[in-house]
Amino acid sequence: PGPPAGSPRVSSDPRADLDSAVLLTRSLLADTRQLAAQMRDKFPADGDHSLDSLPTLAMSAGTLGSLQLPGVLTRLRVDLMSYLRHVQWLRRAGGPSLKTLEPELGALQARLERLLRRLQLLMSRLALPQAAPDQPVIPLGPPASAWGSIRAAHAILGGLHLTLDWAVRGLLLLKTRL
């Protein structure tokens, strides 16, 4: 029999680890898409929404050629930690209107935490430094109104979806370069 469940493997194939991270990211992307669609159905968005406290997009067509694994994993982990904080804030301060989405938001938070653990494991296996965020953490105050929390939810889910979408593409690309 192999090592007990949950024990770290002695040696590891980085491509297999990256594969596993891609699968988790894809799965979270699908969950986020579903929840964002649910949000749009329950609370139709009037135009676009943004939040100053959300991370700026790290990837685009222009950055794909110069992607490197350490930078991508570090930035992705920092950005996802920010989104995790925003999801936690939504669940805590979102108000009664968002309580109807509580089971889904809770599941999303759990999957986000799982992906973050996987990224941390991957970074430690690749002997990459576990960098702390270089931007100061902006404290998240309570939403100004019930409508404010709905707008924030649209912005958070939309931003997370976009970040994960690019993350899948970036990780797939990096896998071919390992």
Partner: antibody
């Protein structure tokens, strides 16, 4: 609701120029890479090029390099395609499309460009 | 000549399951995500499948995608008359540094 609306198509002579526009609404335009694609009458889809969300990076298909230029104005939520030295084989419906990664998740309705003398 | 290869046509009767194939190489399908688009007659294309097998919101789960090696396929179960359309596969090509498409498959519901 995400909407993309192309305009500027029409009839132009070979060797002539045309500028297409794509007005975007319903999303944060400055967060998304944007593409132009085309479809010749009765033919398949063909990718023309992409511009990164902030506008500083552009990539083109080989058949348009040096002739077509993609640009964007994020303050106006508008994407552009400047087409020069047009040829008969550039006759097609031109679509703008949004990219959140590797795919085109929203497309405009298209604008027809006819290159003929 | 398209970089990705699709059969020009496919057909089926209502309720049937049909599959459309798309073959490429290691520089496109082998190393990159495959996306599928549906183009109904006289309309713009619409995203049907992304990242090999994910469905955008609003697309019925009768549609599914899969990928193996340098080939991909789109399956439509419980075929309906409104599925009659052109279907295109697409992927990024590392060698060409471009998005490439299949030539399209015209699906007829008999």
């Amino acid at each position: 609701e995400v909407q993309l609306l192309e305009s500027g198509g029409g009839l132009v002579q070979p060797g002539g120029s045309l500028r297409l526009s794509c007005a975007a609404s319903g999303f944060t335009f400055s967060h998304y890479d944007m593409n132009w694609l085309r479809q010749a009458p009765g033919k398949g889809l063909e990718w023309v090029g992409v511009i990164s969300y902030e506008g500083s990076n552009k990539f083109y298909a080989d058949f348009v390099k040096g002739r077509f230029t993609i640009s964007r104005d994020n303050s106006k939520n508008t994407l552009y395609l400047q087409m020069n030295s047009l040829r008969a084989e550039d006759t097609a419906v031109y679509y703008c499309a949004r990219t959140p990664g590797s795919h085109f998740d929203y497309w405009g309705q298209g604008t027809l460009v006819t290159v003929s003398s | 000549q398209s970089v990705l290869t699709q059969p020009p046509s496919a057909s089926g009767t209502p309720g049937q399951r049909v599959t459309i194939s798309c073959s490429g190489s290691s520089s496109n399908i082998g190393n990159n995500a495959v996306n599928w688009y549906q183009q109904l007659p006289g309309t713009a294309p619409k995203l049907l499948i992304y990242y090999d097998d994910l469905l955008p919101s609003g697309v019925p789960d009768r549609f599914s995608g899969s990928k193996s090696g340098t080939s991909a396929s789109l399956a439509i179960s419980g075929l309906r008359s409104e599925d009659e359309a052109d279907y295109y596969c697409s992927a990024w090509d590392d060698s060409l540094n471009a998005v490439v498409f299949g030539g399209g498959t015209k699906l007829t519901v008999l």
